[in-house]
């Protein structure tokens, strides 16, 4: 005769308030005959939870008919599962006896925990930009997961970041746990269009992770190099001096010229083009009177970048003798 | 009718043992968890721990570990408490009652032993 | 564990008298609470299970009831066979602990 076995196979089972819970019990043998009761818990203050012989379990149904002759199979379902209901529940098999059942074998037991999502990780970066080449630190939340064990990932661009300190809350026990991360991250002068990502994994997602996101662009500043020259050609008695502002982001710019040392308010043509990297080039045109009593003429391209302090780019214009000629001619 | 009759009254020395019996009437002994109580001169009660004679499991509280030691014997239908390394401190009553195999609330602690008095003493 | 506070250790009433002990759970421990009374020979007998049923043989005149985590067992018209003692017992968690005992006294 074989030995009867009680097989409870999930040793941990997660459920969501509200939600139908379903406890696996089969057995492998019909001998000896008497009942299964569920149990949650042990030792003298075990509960009972199910007797289909005896008692009401309005939130209880079996999986079978437990009526059939052969039948092997008793597994429960718990209706409309609360907070109170978690804690590990057996199957037990009680042997026929007169004037009482005896209890005959247990199963291993099913610890049923409340599962509860984590919420939508917020990533949020650093409350000023910083540029290239310095540290920057973002942190990641998510709030209201059971159990406690989580697993957080940082990424930037695909590829796995190891700089970052994670904390849950809180450390005992509890019906929701909490989650943050501080990532650290070095700029690079590309990272206008990069993304860090932040990747939490849990139990209860079914191996989907849920991701919250951040783009470098927000945090990052790459300021500007200027370059001001001198167009070799003239037009007319005017002299095409140009302002290249390039590689800056963010796009807030403000660029004026001075002519030795006057603001010159005038208007100027100007483009604004967008670079692959995401940073951004300004060109500035400005013309320049010549006259013969003009020797000296020193202009200066100066730039306020994203409110930081002002850059500026002079150029003491070289006006050759054949174009004073020139301007001279032109001049009434 | 459900009873449980303890052994005498028991008079030990210090360093000794006692071994102190409970036996049931009156109902199926394998469905109900034995607990013993210790009552100690002019004080409260405090549980010991019970056993269950289905299988030998038992509980105890923390306080008594090492110190109470419970076994049964079911052909009899007979509760056993060991006391050992015995002390001033476990010159006590010692009480057994029952509880159903399950938490049921009308079957904690309906019936009670008469007590067996332990004196310890030089 | 969970402490039970039983207050108040001792009380002097008179015959006919209303009286009520309480114990105070440190912990939640829902209805899982006997009120046992013990007579001066130690005979030890249950009165109340669950909080508030009556066991079978007990008179009416006892009662238990409960407020959040105080319980209470109120006897409503003294009687002289009811000058003992009373304890309160929580089942709903190991180690199972009692109040610290009532003496009950006659004025």
């Known amino acids: 005769e074989e030995e009867l076995q009680m097989i409870q196979p999930e040793k941990l089972l997660l459920v969501t308030v509200g939600k139908t819970a379903t406890l696996h019990c089969t057995v492998t043998s019909l001998l000896p005959v008497g009942p299964v009761l569920w149990f949650r818990g042990v030792g003298p203050g075990r509960e009972l939870i199910y007797n289909q012989k005896e008692g009401h379990f309005p939130r209880v149904t079996t999986v079978s008919d437990l009526t059939k002759r052969n039948n092997m199979d008793f597994s429960i379902r718990i209706s409309s599962i609360t907070p109170a209901d978690v804690g590990t529940y057996y199957c037990v098999k009680f042997r026929k006896g007169s004037p009482e059942n005896v209890e005959f074998k247990s199963g291993p037991g099913t610890e049923m925990a409340l599962g509860a999502k984590p919420s939508a990780p917020v990533v949020l970066g650093p409350a000023a930009r910083t540029t290239p080449e310095h540290t920057v630190s973002f942190t990641c939340e998510s709030h209201g997961f059971s159990p406690r064990d989580i697993t957080l990932k940082w990424f930037k661009n695909g590829n796995e970041l190891s700089d970052f300190q994670t904390n849950v809350d809180p450390t005992g026990q509890s019906v929701a746990y909490s989650i943050r991360s501080t990532a650290r991250v070095v700029l690079d002068p590309w990272d206008v269009r990069s993304q860090v990502i932040c990747e939490v994994a849990h139990v209860t997602l079914q191996g989907d992770p849920l991701r919250g996101t951040a783009n470098l662009s927000e945090a990052i500043r790459v300021p500007p190099t200027l370059e001001v020259t001198q167009q070799p050609m003239r037009v007319g008695n005017q002299v095409n001096v140009t302002c290249q502002v390039r590689k800056f982001y963010p796009q807030s710019l403000q660029l004026t010229w001075s002519e030795n040392g006057n603001v010159c308010q005038r208007e100027t043509a100007s483009t604004l083009t967008e670079n692959k990297d995401g940073t951004y080039n300004w060109t500035s045109w400005f013309l320049v009177n010549i006259s013969d009593q003009r020797d000296d003429v020193v202009l200066t391209c100066q730039v306020k970048h994203d409110g930081q302090l002002a850059v500026s780019k002079r150029l003491a214009l070289e006006v050759t003798v054949h174009q004073k000629d020139q301007s001279s001619d032109a001049t009434p | 009718e459900v009873q449980f009759q303890q052994s005498g009254t028991v008079l030990a020395r210090p360093g000794t043992s006692v071994k102190m019996s409970c036996k049931a009437s009156g109902s199926t002994f394998t469905s109900y968890w034995m607990h013993w109580v210790k009552q100690g001169p002019g004080q409260g009660l405090q549980w010991i721990g019970a056993?269950?004679?289905?299988?030998?499991?038992?509980t105890y509280n923390q306080k008594f570990k090492g110190k109470a030691e419970l076994t049964v014997v079911t052909s009899t239908s007979t509760a056993y408490m060991e006391v050992s390394s015995l002390t001033n401190e476990d010159s006590a009553v010692y009480y057994c009652?029952?509880?159903?195999?399950?938490?049921?609330?009308?079957?904690?602690?309906?019936?009670w032993g008469q007590g067996t008095l332990v004196t310890v003493s030089a | 564990d969970i402490q039970m506070t039983q207050s108040p250790s001792s009380l002097s009433a008179s015959l006919g008298e209303r009286v009520s002990l309480t114990c105070r759970a440190s912990q939640d421990i829902g209805s899982r609470l006997n009120w046992l009374q013990q007579e001066p020979d130690g005979t030890i007998k249950r009165l109340i299970y669950?909080?508030?049923s009556l066991d079978s043989g007990v008179p009416k005149r006892f009662s238990g009831s409960r407020s959040g985590s105080d319980y209470s067992l109120t006897i409503s018209g003294l009687e002289s066979e009811d000058f003992v003692d009373y304890y309160c017992?929580?089942?709903?968690?190991?180690?199972?602990?009692f109040g610290g005992g009532t003496k009950l006294e006659i004025n």
């Open positions: 017992l929580q089942y709903a968690s190991s180690p199972f602990t």
């Open positions: 056993i269950y004679p289905v299988n030998n499991d038992t």
């Open positions: 009652t029952r509880s159903f195999y399950y938490s049921l609330d009308a079957a904690w602690f309906v019936y």
């Open positions: 669950a909080t508030s």
